[in-house]
Each structure stands twice: as structure tokens, then as C-alpha cells.
């Protein structure tokens, strides 16, 4: 056990050790009790032993010698196993276009040297995924850079120089994908001091959404080292993690096509924005049209949604249907319509915060309603809720992760529908996953346009 | 609804104790850092106490500091000020308000109690 | 005494442009951005303004802050009977163990 000496050197090392875990691997220190040995000795090893095989040590459950360099290692102060503070936003920014600011800057560098770094950061991932970045000077950006020391405004100090070189916090309002630069570090453009480049990469990687890697080649591994910036590229794993976020460059999937042409049903990158049944036929959305799939027949035919429903609007997001009622319920950013009997109800559109979202729901990403239970379910994020539609009211122990309940699916759907008495139909990009909810797993995997014969 | 409701205040002795809640309701209670500021009569604002979205991170004010305790439950969505040897001073109306960060500052506040 | 020094009171007739001005040092203004909080008589205070100028959702343009060096100063253009309240400026501040700082509050008067 790691409390076997009461030299002060050793004493020095577990409390030092103590702190490390408490930061960035979740060990309750109000849970060790010094004087109960054993106790506290065994809830330390175990973290000894995660962070161990997180970073890719021996794993010893001892704070042996490269367990304390490692500890000692300059790094970013995001935990590696829990998140730094997860933001109401989710786990993903939910548009392509994404501004940041720089609020300060540091003494180290010249302004234009950190503006190109910064700028060269937003790059790396801009080149992977489809995102988009445009510095902006004034007003609130999504992202904001700031140099700052010590207690800077965020309940999360700096500690002085080496140690935590920089944190970044999760997309969402706020403080969310903001991104903070320790000012007791020596910011360079070299291998001298820190790398403002390569520190940047990383946070931004944050500020996107992305966890720590236990991957040593990872530009997302949570300790700083130095690698040649005119020859740094993303890991594989970097790229898997923020392309499995938002897809890649060519995947533009969640923006409207540019010119609003009609998409290629079989094309084999189809995703859609929404789907739901409407009695014995299928209505798949995407942008201002829809296709009408009648259940068992070939044949399917693409609509302008306005031809159908004038008053509604495109790029409906989310939809379900309560059969019994004859009701579909369409859902686009924080409103939805009522349809009855395939019209649009008066009185609409109402505000999703009726149906007793909180207010950092701003939008439904996918809804589908089971008749065996009668409830609706709600997909935000990575994160769904659960409204029962006799009570007309959520149920309560919601919001919950999609990843822990529907194995296999998520973290984040575009859409989903019910059919044959036992089958979710979940989307998610140009993949289709059917769901037997009494079984409680995937059954089968297809393209999403699979409906269509393609 | 963002909500803050607080609740436990009362009259008491000096050198007696209290102990506020604040319940949340509406918003992901755990992602956000909480407060308290007291208000006495007649009088301005003042910063009591905070603590991080964890818990694992708090700070006082030098007037309270050694005599008040701040903590949260996140599975109850509920703040607390555990308030000691309590003096005529501390005489105020208590305010739990969400948020806290220097940039964002506190955006949403309970009524009072 | 406060860390912050805001006018006691200030008053406008409606329609008018009134300011507030709030000072303060380098461990404070001089290094933090300042948020404005608006108590409207036997409520809650509320967010008016935060980071120096920026305005929440649903409080009205005619709500501006700005900031410079270690001052700050809340502008209330188009003043309206229903803005007569207690204003008060805060910020964190490096050199206290406890990070916020609030001004003393000054009061609106809307003649």
C-alpha cells in the first residue's frame, strides 16, 4: 500500500499524490481518513492504479518512480476519467459555423504569433470534421481564449508555473467551450517554454467536446510534450473521436443542402432530419421535402413538405405519432405543430418547454412514441427523456444518457421511429440501427435509406 | 422553469445555528457552480460563500469564514449553508443565485430567506 | 465599506439617458470583467449585464455597460418608470480570499 512509510519525503509523495487523484481522477479525499489505514490505503491504490492504466504505466497500485514523474509531468487540468464541468449544451456544439474570441493576450508572445497560433489550432480540426471557425473582436464568442493565473473566475485556479499548463470547458452557453491559458507558463511559438500551438490543439479539443485520450500518441493524451509543429499531425484516435462528434469534412449532413436541391434518395451519405410513421405509411424528412414510404411497398414518392403543410416550416428536426389519436407531433428548434387527421391544428406552434424541458433545451434532435407504454421518448443530445403522454407530464429520473439505456446507440441520434409492435428504427448519419426494445439490443444495422430499395 | 427556492432561516440566538436550502429545479443543477449573498436591512449585497459544480472546491468570505459551511447534494439538486456561532451581523436575508463565474456572473436568483 | 464605490442615488425623468458609474482597483476592475445586477423593490436581484457589456436574453438595449481601466459604468437610455431600482456593480477579486465584490448599490429614481 502507498501509506507504508513515515519518512517526510514519503509523506510528501502521498499528499501530493492525494491531490492529484482528487483532480483528475476523482478520489474523495473527505473519504480517506489518514488514521484508518487500510481503508484509505485501498481506495488510493484503486485510483493509483486507474490513473496507472489510463496513462499507460506499470500498473502497480504503488506510487513507484514513474508514477510519480508522470504525476509531476506538466498537463492539462481536465480529469482525465470525469468530466471538468459538463455543460447544459451537451457533449457537441450543434452547428457548423463557430466563432471564438481571444480576450486577452499573453506578454510572452507577440500578438500576431499567438493570433496565428490559435488560428493554426482551429485549423487542425477544421481540416478533419466540417466545422468552421471566424475569429471575432467583440461581443460573446462560443470560445473564448484567455490568459489569466492563478484564481482566474472559473472555480478552477491555475497552480503557478508547471503543473497545469491550461483547462478548456465543454461546448455550451456560458463558460462553456471556453478555453483557459495558465500565465505563469512561458508561452512560445518553439519547443522552448510551452507550446502555445500544441497546448491549443488539445484545449480546443475540449472546447469541441472531446475527453482525455489514454492514448500516449494522442494529440488528446492529458500530458504535455513536444513534438516538431511543422510535422504534428492528429492520431488516429483524435480523428476518430471528434469525426464520431461531427462527421467529416464532405459530411455537411446536419446543414441543409446549399441550394435546398432535392437530395439523392439513394445516396449512400443520406441521412435524415426526421422520421415517423402516420398510420400504414413512413414519412422520412429532410430539409423542405419529404418522402412517403407506404409500409410494404416498393414504390416512394418525394414531397415538398410546404405542398403538404403550408404553415409548417422545413427542416423539421424531430416527429412522432400517436396513432390511437390520429396526432403527429412535429418539432423544429424550441417549437412543435399538431397535426390531426394529416391537418395542421390552430393554436400552433406551442414551445417544447411545455412538454417540461428545462430551458437549455433549445431543440429536439429525435422523438418516438411507444403505444405498449404509452410514453413519448425524447432525444437531446446525448441525453433522453421520458413524457408520459396520459399524465401529460415527464417522468420523473429524466433526463438519462442515451448510451446507458439503448446499448449500442448514440451518443446522439437524428432520428427514430416505431414499427411492427417491437422495433425501434434508430438513425443516426447515413446508418440505420433496427432495436428490439424487448431485448434491449440492435438487431440489425442498414443504411438509412434502406426503405428505399437502394 | 429555472428555479431557485430557498428555505430554513429563522430567528435565532446569538451563538446559535441555521441551516439553509436552496433547492433547484429546471436546469442541470450539477454543471453549475451556486452561491449564497446576504442581504441585511437596508443595506447592499454582499457575497457570502461558493462552491464549484463538483462540491470539491468552496470559498468563504473573511466575515464567515471558520463559522459557515457551504455544501451540495447534485442528486438532490440542493445547496446548503450550514451557519455556526451566528452573530447579530449575519442578520440578513440569504440568496442562493446560480452561476458565479467572473465572466457570466450569477444569472439566476432564488427570492430569499 | 465597500471594495467597489458606486453614487449612492441617482435619479432621471423618463426618457432620459442616466449612468452609474462604479470604481474600483487593479485586483478587482482593473483585472476582471464586471456584471450589473438590478433589484427592483422587494424582489430577487437579476442579471443585467455581464462580462463589461454584455446583455442577457430578455433585458431590453437600452441597458449598456462599458469598462475602463478600473471603472465601470452602467448607461440606462430611454429611461422607463418600471427601471427604478437599486443597481449594483460586482466583480471577482484576486486580492480577498472570497472572490466577489459588490458595489454598495445605487438607487434610480425615476421622477
Known amino acids: 500500500l502507498p501509506l507504508n512509510s513515515s519518512t517526510s519525503l514519503e509523506k510528501n509523495n502521498v499528499l501530493f499524490g492525494e491531490r492529484y487523484l482528487e483532480k483528475f481522477y476523482g478520489l474523495e479525499i473527505n473519504k480517506l481518513p489518514v488514521t484508518k489505514m487500510k481503508y484509505s490505503g485501498n481506495l488510493m491504490k484503486e485510483k493509483i492504479q486507474e490513473m496507472q492504466h489510463f496513462l499507460g504505466l506499470k500498473v502497480t497500485g504503488q506510487l513507484d518512480t514513474s508514477t510519480l514523474e508522470m504525476m509531476h509531468a506538466p498537463r492539462c487540468g481536465v480529469p482525465d476519467v470525469h468530466h471538468f464541468r459538463e455543460m447544459p449544451g451537451g457533449p457537441v456544439w450543434r452547428k457548423h459555423y463557430i466563432t471564438y474570441r481571444i480576450n486577452n493576450y499573453t506578454p510572452d508572445m507577440n500578438r500576431e504569433d499567438v493570433d496565428y497560433a490559435i488560428r493554426k489550432a482551429f485549423q487542425v480540426w477544421s481540416n478533419v470534421t466540417p466545422l468552421k471557425f471566424s475569429k471575432i473582436n467583440t461581443g460573446m464568442a462560443d470560445i473564448l481564449v484567455v490568459f489569466a493565473r492563478g484564481a482566474h473566475g472559473d472555480f478552477h485556479a491555475f497552480d503557478g508555473k508547471g503543473g497545469i499548463l491550461a483547462h478548456a470547458f465543454g461546448p455550451g452557453s456560458g463558460i462553456g467551450g471556453d478555453a483557459h491559458f495558465d500565465e505563469d507558463e512561458f508561452w512560445t511559438t518553439h519547443s522552448g517554454g510551452t507550446n502555445l500551438f500544441l497546448t491549443a490543439v488539445h484545449e480546443i479539443g475540449h472546447s469541441l467536446g472531446l475527453g482525455h485520450s489514454s492514448d500516449p500518441k494522442a494529440v488528446m493524451f492529458p500530458t504535455y510534450k513536444y513534438v516538431d509543429i511543422n510535422t504534428f499531425r492528429l492520431s488516429a484516435d483524435d480523428i476518430r473521436g471528434i469525426q464520431s462528434l461531427y462527421g467529416d469534412p464532405k459530411e455537411n449532413q446536419r446543414l441543409p443542402n446549399p441550394d435546398n436541391s432535392e437530395p439523392a434518395l439513394c445516396d449512400p451519405n443520406l441521412s435524415f432530419d426526421a422520421v415517423t410513421t402516420v398510420g400504414n405509411k413512413i414519412f422520412f424528412f429532410k430539409d423542405r421535402f419529404f418522402w412517403l414510404k407506404v409500409s410494404e411497398r416498393p414504390k416512394t414518392s418525394v414531397n415538398l413538405i410546404s405542398s403538404l403543410w403550408p404553415t409548417l416550416p422545413s427542416g423539421i428536426e424531430a416527429a412522432y405519432e400517436i396513432e390511437a389519436r390520429n396526432q403527429v407531433f412535429l418539432f423544429k428548434d424550441d417549437k412543435y405543430w399538431l397535426i390531426s387527421n394529416l391537418r395542421p391544428e390552430p393554436n400552433y406552434p406551442k414551445s417544447i418547454h411545455s412538454f417540461g424541458f428545462p430551458n437549455f433545451v433549445k431543440k429536439i434532435d429525435a422523438a418516438v412514441f411507444n403505444p405498449r407504454f404509452y410514453r413519448t421518448y425524447f432525444f437531446v443530445d446525448n441525453q433522453y427523456w421520458r413524457y408520459d403522454e396520459r399524465r401529460q407530464m415527464m417522468d420523473p429520473g429524466y433526463p438519462k444518457l442515451i448510451t446507458k439505456n439503448f446499448q449500442g446507440i448514440g451518443p446522439k441520434i437524428d432520428a427514430v421511429f416505431y414499427s411492427k409492435n417491437k422495433y425501434y428504427y434508430f438513425f443516426q448519419g447515413s446508418n440505420q440501427f433496427e432495436y428490439d426494445f424487448l431485448l434491449q439490443r440492435i438487431t440489425k444495422t442498414l443504411k438509412s435509406n434502406s426503405w428505399f430499395g437502394c | 422553469e429555472v428555479q431557485l427556492l430557498e428555505s430554513g432561516g429563522g430567528l435565532v440566538q446569538p451563538g446559535g445555528s441555521l441551516r439553509l436550502s436552496c433547492a433547484a429545479s429546471g436546469f442541470t443543477f450539477s454543471v453549475y457552480p451556486m452561491q449564497w449573498v446576504r442581504q441585511a436591512p437596508g443595506k447592499g449585497l454582499e457575497w457570502v460563500s461558493g462552491?464549484?459544480?463538483?462540491?470539491?472546491?468552496?470559498m468563504y468570505a473573511d466575515s464567515v469564514k471558520g463559522r459557515f459551511t457551504i455544501s451540495r447534494d447534485n442528486s438532490k439538486n440542493t445547496l446548503y449553508l450550514q451557519m455556526n456561532s451566528l452573530r447579530a451581523e449575519d442578520m440578513a436575508v440569504y440568496y442562493c443565485a446560480r452561476g458565479g463565474d467572473s465572466l457570466y456572473g450569477m444569472d439566476v436568483w432564488g427570492q430569499g430567506t | 465599506q465597500s471594495a467597489l464605490t458606486q453614487p449612492p442615488s441617482t435619479s432621471g425623468t423618463p426618457g432620459q439617458r442616466v449612468t452609474i458609474s462604479c470604481s474600483g482597483s487593479g485586483s478587482n476592475i482593473g483585472s476582471n470583467p464586471v456584471n450589473w445586477y438590478q433589484q427592483l423593490p422587494g424582489a430577487a436581484p437579476k442579471l443585467l449585464i455581464y462580462?463589461?457589456?454584455l446583455r442577457p436574453s430578455g433585458v431590453p438595449d437600452r441597458f449598456s455597460g462599458s469598462k475602463s481601466g478600473t471603472s465601470a459604468s452602467l448607461a440606462i437610455s430611454g429611461l422607463q418608470s418600471e427601471d427604478e431600482a437599486d443597481y449594483y456593480c460586482a466583480a471577482w477579486d484576486y486580492s480577498l480570499n472570497g472572490p466577489w465584490v459588490f458595489g454598495g448599490g445605487t438607487k434610480l429614481t425615476v421622477l
Open positions: 462580462s463589461n457589456d
Open positions: 462552491i464549484s459544480s463538483s462540491g470539491g472546491f468552496t
